[in-house]
Amino acid sequence: VTCDDYYYGFGCNKFCRPRDDFFGHYACDQNGNKTCMEGWMGPECNRAICRQGCSPKHGSCKLPGDCRCQYGWQGLYCD
């Protein structure tokens, strides 16, 4: 059985479209499961992994490896 584009698995009922944009950064494995690109995490791989040590409470990042501080906090790790 050959599945349609972006369909995977037994019965071709698993859907996965690789993407690298605001809505997700992932590839699809042979079973149609999302595998996040380096630097991204979450169910949709759309949450950047911040700089190691970046404060989860006072820092955040839009891009992998970044660490942007909330107002009133500073330092390499916003701590």
């Epitope: 584009d5 859907f15 996965c16 605001f22 979450g42 169910p43 949709e44 949450r47």
Partner: antibody, heavy 119, light 107 residues
Framework: QVQLVQSGAELKKPGSSVKVSCKAS????????MHWVRQAPGQGLEWMGA????????AYNQKFKGRVTLTADKSTSTAYMELSSLRSEDTAVYYC????????????WGQGTLVTVSS | DIQMTQSPSSLSASVGDRVTITCRAS??????LAWYQQKPGKAPKLLIY???TLADAVPSRFSGSGSGTDYTLTISSLQPEDFATYYC?????????FGQGTKLEIK
């Protein structure tokens, strides 16, 4: 279960701004974008934009770029949509909405917030 | 931007009828299409995603088909609760646009 609860109806003057809130519960707030869709009276649905609450990244419909600002407060799991320079054509119900699991489109919706723009 | 053209804009039918609503995209959306049902004063409800997959708790009388640019929503046997407005929406690339809607009324 996933719930999105929006703020109440607003009556605004032309030229002013409105800020609508959407409090999320039942899932990890930073795992999914929050999208905003509006619907003018008797009209269809219009996607306005989305925010990734984890890092604050945004994607906007060019039609609204410059007038709409999406923000999110991780500490309260609340997303906000602010629309400025309001005109009568902005009178609409504004919905926050979230994708489902495994790349579904909009499976979860807030109850909607009616914004009326009138002098 | 990809535009979605939905037809018809309104439709009168009777309980038990088979009804078809079509949606055409201005470009290939690769099955990245959803269908929603909306009743007055309520938020839209997801019926079908990825062109043909039924959302949770949606009755099997609803079905979706199509590929490329042309897609169809079929209700095999209309029930009284199905009278509502239906929208298609693509989610291939931003902006995620909707069709203009099809109002399904009782004949």
């Amino acid at each position: 279960q996933v719930q999105l609860v929006q703020s109440g109806a607003e009556l605004k003057k032309p030229g002013s701004s409105v800020k609508v809130s959407c409090k999320a519960s039942g899932y990890t707030f930073t795992d999914y974008e929050m999208h905003w869709v509006r619907q003018a009276p008797g009209q269809g649905l219009e996607w306005m934009g989305a925010i990734q609450p984890g890092g604050g990244g945004t994607a906007y419909n060019q039609k609204f770029k410059g007038r709409v600002t999406l923000t999110a407060d991780k500490s309260t799991s609340t997303a906000y949509m602010e629309l400025s320079s309001l005109r009568s054509e902005d009178t609409a119900v504004y919905y926050c909405t979230r994708r489902g699991y495994d790349d579904y489109p909009f499976a979860y919706w807030g109850q909607g917030t009616l914004v009326t723009v009138s002098s | 931007d990809i535009q979605m053209t939905q037809s018809p804009s309104s439709l009168s039918a009777s309980v038990g009828d088979r009804v078809t609503i079509t949606c055409r995209a201005s470009g290939n959306i690769h099955n990245y299409l959803a269908w929603y049902q909306q009743k007055p004063g309520k938020a839209p409800k997801l019926l079908i995603y990825n062109a043909k997959t039924l959302a949770d708790a949606v009755p099997s009388r609803f079905s979706g088909s199509g590929s490329g640019t042309d897609y169809t929503l079929t209700i095999s046997s209309l029930q009284p609760e199905d009278f509502a407005t239906y929208y298609c929406q693509h989610f291939w690339s931003a902006p995620w646009t909707f069709g203009q809607g099809t109002k399904l009324e009782i004949k």
